[in-house]
């Protein structure tokens, strides 16, 4: 495939990545799938600078990111290492709260109204952010 050099229409470019901000809500798995179908992934936050950028665009609204612990360890969807990477949890989070009564704990991470992170039930229909890197090869076949 060819290398992507500019962002698709309706995506926002920032620091060699493209971002798409939803205005509707989906469960985490559906949001994850939506981004994959766009040859992207749920946003992976790797720095305070990127955190502030995303926070500015989403406003004070619960919004899914590409971080989950559905199989035990916290994992970023693009393979970025959680342990050594940027973190911005709210105080006392993540807490894997069981008190919601929906079964299980809380396995998916989202931006809260102040931008800091919380873990929540993955089925909740929150907004989401997709991200794709400009320097990665596109899945589209090259023009002949």
């Amino acid at each position: 495939g060819s290398e992507r050099t500019c962002c698709p229409v309706n995506w926002v470019e920032h620091e060699r990545s493209c971002y798409w901000f939803s205005r509707s809500g989906k469960a985490w798995a559906d949001a994850d799938n939506y981004c994959r179908l766009e040859d992207a992934h749920l946003v992976v936050v790797t720095s305070w600078e990127e955190q502030k950028f995303v926070q500015h665009h989403i406003g004070p609204v619960n919004t899914w990111m590409g971080l989950h612990d559905q199989n035990g360890p916290w994992k970023w969807v693009d393979g970025t290492d959680y342990e050594t990477g940027f973190k911005n949890w709210r105080p006392e989070q993540p807490d894997d709260w069981y008190g919601h009564g929906l079964g299980g704990g809380e396995d998916c991470a989202h931006f809260t109204d102040d931008g800091r992170w919380n873990d929540d039930v993955c089925q909740r229909p929150y907004r989401w952010v997709c991200e794709t890197e400009l320097d990665k090869a596109s899945q589209e076949p090259p023009l002949l």
Partner: antibody, heavy 115, light 107 residues
Framework: EVQLVESGGGLVKPGGSLRLSCAAS????????MNWVRQAPGKGLEWVSS????????YYADSVKGRFTISRDNAKNSLYLQMNSLRAEDTAVYYC????????WGQGTLVTVSS | DIQMTQSPSSLSASVGDRVTITCRAS??????LAWFQQKSGKAPKSLIS???SLQTGVPSRFSGSGSGTDFTLTISSLQPEDFATYYC?????????FGGGTKVEIK
């Protein structure tokens, strides 16, 4: 590499007390709920207690409620189980395990309650 | 409390055999089911989470399936190192509960 190492087991008389510790390394301890699980000799696995990442939520099995206290120190990457009023039926290998699906386990520490 | 019933409690099999262990929950557990392998004198090892997701490093001959209340652990071709005791566990709600275990022995 995730590592969990239990200590503090031993022989104690009925009615006595013991404090177990679990030293965690290789992961961001403060991001994970932790648990104690036990196994009596020749028996199956029994969940004992859970504690959330910042100690906000704590749960106990009915068999230990009021006698055992789970706690953690995130600054020291350590999990604890204070066991009071011990009974013969508390004799078991005690394991610490990460998160509620127990993805990593320590090697266990043996607690024997006998007169 | 959710009761977890495992069957059989023990089975004898040969290397290369396909082995199936079942676990039934007393009520729906939303696929919050894990499987563990425990060898004699050792700590349990996590094999599967959310009913069917293989944990990192677990051989692909292990698989999990099921939903609702009925779940299955399958070993497609039993290897010598697979002779052990297997446990299921629900983490849908507290108290967290285990099945009674299934001991897989050499025929």
């Amino acid at each position: 590499e995730v590592q969990l190492v239990e200590s503090g087991g031993g022989l104690v008389k009925p009615g006595g007390s013991l404090r177990l510790s679990c030293a965690a390394s290789g992961f961001t301890f403060s991001s994970y709920n932790m648990n104690w699980v036990r196994q009596a000799p020749g028996k199956g696995l029994e969940w004992v207690s859970s504690i959330s990442s910042s100690s906000s939520y704590i749960y106990y099995a009915d068999s230990v409620k009021g006698r055992f206290t789970i706690s953690r120190d995130n600054a020291k990457n350590s999990l604890y189980l204070q066991m009071n009023s011990l009974r013969a039926e508390d004799t078991a290998v005690y394991y610490c395990a990460r998160v509620n699906l127990f993805d990593y386990w320590g090697q266990g520490t043996l607690v024997t309650v006998s007169s | 409390d959710i009761q977890m019933t495992q069957s059989p409690s023990s089975l004898s099999a040969s290397v290369g055999d396909r082995v199936t262990i079942t676990c039934r929950a007393s009520q729906g557990i939303n696929n919050y089911l894990a499987w563990f392998q425990q060898k004699s004198g050792k700590a349990p090892k996590s094999l599967i989470s959310v009913a069917s997701s293989l944990q990192t490093g677990v051989p692909s001959r292990f698989s999990g399936s099921g939903s609702g209340t009925d779940f299955t652990l399958t070993i497609s071709s039993l290897q010598p190192e697979d002779f052990a005791t297997y446990y299921c566990q629900q983490y849908n709600s507290y108290p967290l509960t285990f099945g009674g275990g299934t001991k897989v022995e050499i025929k």
